[in-house]
Interface confidence: low
């Protein structure tokens, strides 16, 4: 997260880290005791999932292996459309005040809505500085019409933009797959943006979760 702040401890109990060994690979969001939602471009053969801590590599955090993941069938590495994936945990998480599932959206929030994005991604760009603490940024949803002025045809119908005018605050490498939460519901998953990160008026681009609720529910049901 560029130009963000340290999240209030315990305020993001649904935030998970997808680790490759001990190294951060992507962010993710707990949606069920067996399931984590993340970006399709975060796909690996297997994952070490860290839950219940704001510190990356925390020894006291829950760590659960995941060997199955289900990309959206329409995901394209070329256009980045349908950048969403479900990761099935090998064993159920132990829910607590530190580990909770996020609320999936009932509706799509409108432009101008205030949201928070979080992650352990680099706080500087193009040179990288990975924080140990979970970082947050407060951003507002931007209309597709406005966002298309920047990203033109790259912006798909199920992509969501968020940012703050003239501000550098944004997501960056390592934040991918992490949650954009608005009014206590999951509205976005960090997907992509301009590089170097943090260029003012280049919004962060997210997968718009409200457009995928049916796919999420059906996929979890099919692979129970």
């Amino acid at each position: 997260i560029i130009d963000g702040y340290k999240c209030k401890e315990g305020s993001h109990p649904w935030q998970v880290a997808l680790l490759k060994g001990n190294q951060l690979h992507c962010g993710g969001v707990l949606v069920d005791k067996y399931w984590v939602l993340t970006a399709a471009h975060c796909k690996m053969g297997q994952y070490q999932v860290q839950l219940g801590s704001d510190k990356i590599g925390d020894q006291s955090a829950q760590k659960i292996k995941a060997t199955k993941s289900f990309r959206h069938p329409g995901y394209s590495t070329k256009t980045h459309v349908n950048d969403i994936m479900l990761v099935r945990l090998d064993e159920p998480v132990k829910m607590s005040s530190k580990v909770e599932a996020v609320q999936l959206p009932e509706h799509c929030e409108p432009p101008g809505t205030s949201c928070t994005v979080s992650g352990w991604g680099t706080t500087t760009s193009p040179d990288v500085t990975f924080p140990s603490d979970l970082m947050c940024s407060d951003v507002k949803l931007i209309s597709s019409r406005e966002c298309k002025k920047v990203y033109k045809d790259l912006l798909g119908k199920t992509m969501l933009c968020a940012g703050i005018p003239d501000s550098k605050t944004n997501t960056c490498n390592g934040d991918s797959g992490g949650p954009l939460v608005c009014n206590d519901t999951l509205q976005g998953l960090v997907s992509w943006g301009t590089y170097p990160c943090g260029q003012p008026n280049d919004p962060g681009v997210y997968t718009q979760v409200c457009k995928y609720k049916r796919w999420v529910m059906e996929t979890m049901k099919t692979h129970r």
Epitope: L24, C26, K78, S125, K152, D153, L154, S176, W192, T194
Partner: antibody
């Protein structure tokens, strides 16, 4: 399959400028990074800078800042590299190369700095 | 700028030999490193990206490993067509920087 085709060899006088083109065919152009890399005779490779056509903003190596301008024309799928105030040390083969899509995820794509290369353009600077 | 130090600068080897080339970054670059092969008068060709991922169409005798600051390219059994110059490049931060190159010659 994407191909990058560069303009022909150039002979230039010291102090002048050269503009090399790189046309992409057979695939998407706008959302991929196009970099320019040069190689002096018998020497190694040197990254000069790059651009993501759809965003239009270029990044340059400090060494070339102020002397190099990288631009792209989406309508013709062509990238350009202009180097000014030429000196004899600028004699080199100039390559354009396509980089990974500009997505800052943790996907391995960012590790692909350059996956497809042009054939190279020889620029000779001589009085 | 991140400096990339490649060694050795040249190596003489025979067909069938195992060849190892190393690249060291002046600071941590995670896994954002690629390896290229270049033959005289030709453009470089991508072999390995993200430190260890084999580019499609590249023979499996080529492999890459490492993360952070130390990286290795290995050719498990050198073939006649592998005699060339090899370069590493870091793609972690601008400006992208190349190693000085390793020339693999016939013994």
């Amino acid at each position: 399959q994407v191909q990058l085709v560069q303009s022909g060899a150039e002979v230039k006088k010291p102090g002048s400028s050269v503009k090399v083109s790189c046309k992409a065919s057979g695939g998407t152009f706008s959302n991929y990074a196009i970099s320019w890399v040069r190689q002096a005779p018998g020497q190694g490779l040197e990254w000069m800078g790059g651009i993501i056509p759809i965003f239009g903003t270029a990044n340059y190596a400090q060494k070339f800042q102020g002397r190099v301008t990288i631009t792209a024309d989406e309508s013709t799928s062509t990238a350009y590299m202009e180097l000014s105030s030429l000196r004899s040390e600028d004699t080199a083969v100039y390559y354009c190369a396509r980089g990974a899509p500009n997505y800052y995820g943790s996907s391995s794509s960012r590790g692909i700095a350059f996956d497809i290369w042009g054939q190279g353009t020889m620029v000779t600077v001589s009085s | 700028d991140i400096q990339m130090t490649q060694s050795p600068s040249s190596v003489s080897a025979s067909v069938g030999d195992r060849v190892t080339i190393t690249c060291r970054a002046s600071q941590g670059i995670s896994s954002w490193l690629a390896w290229y092969q270049q033959k005289p008068g030709k453009a470089p060709k991508l072999l390995i990206y993200a430190a260890s991922s084999l580019q499609s169409g590249v023979p499996s005798r080529f492999s890459g490993s490492g993360s952070g600051t130390d990286f290795t390219l290995t050719i498990s059994s050198l073939q006649p067509e592998d005699f060339a110059t090899y370069y590493c490049v870091q793609a972690n931060a601008f400006p992208y920087t190349f190693g000085g190159g390793t020339k693999v010659e016939i013994k």
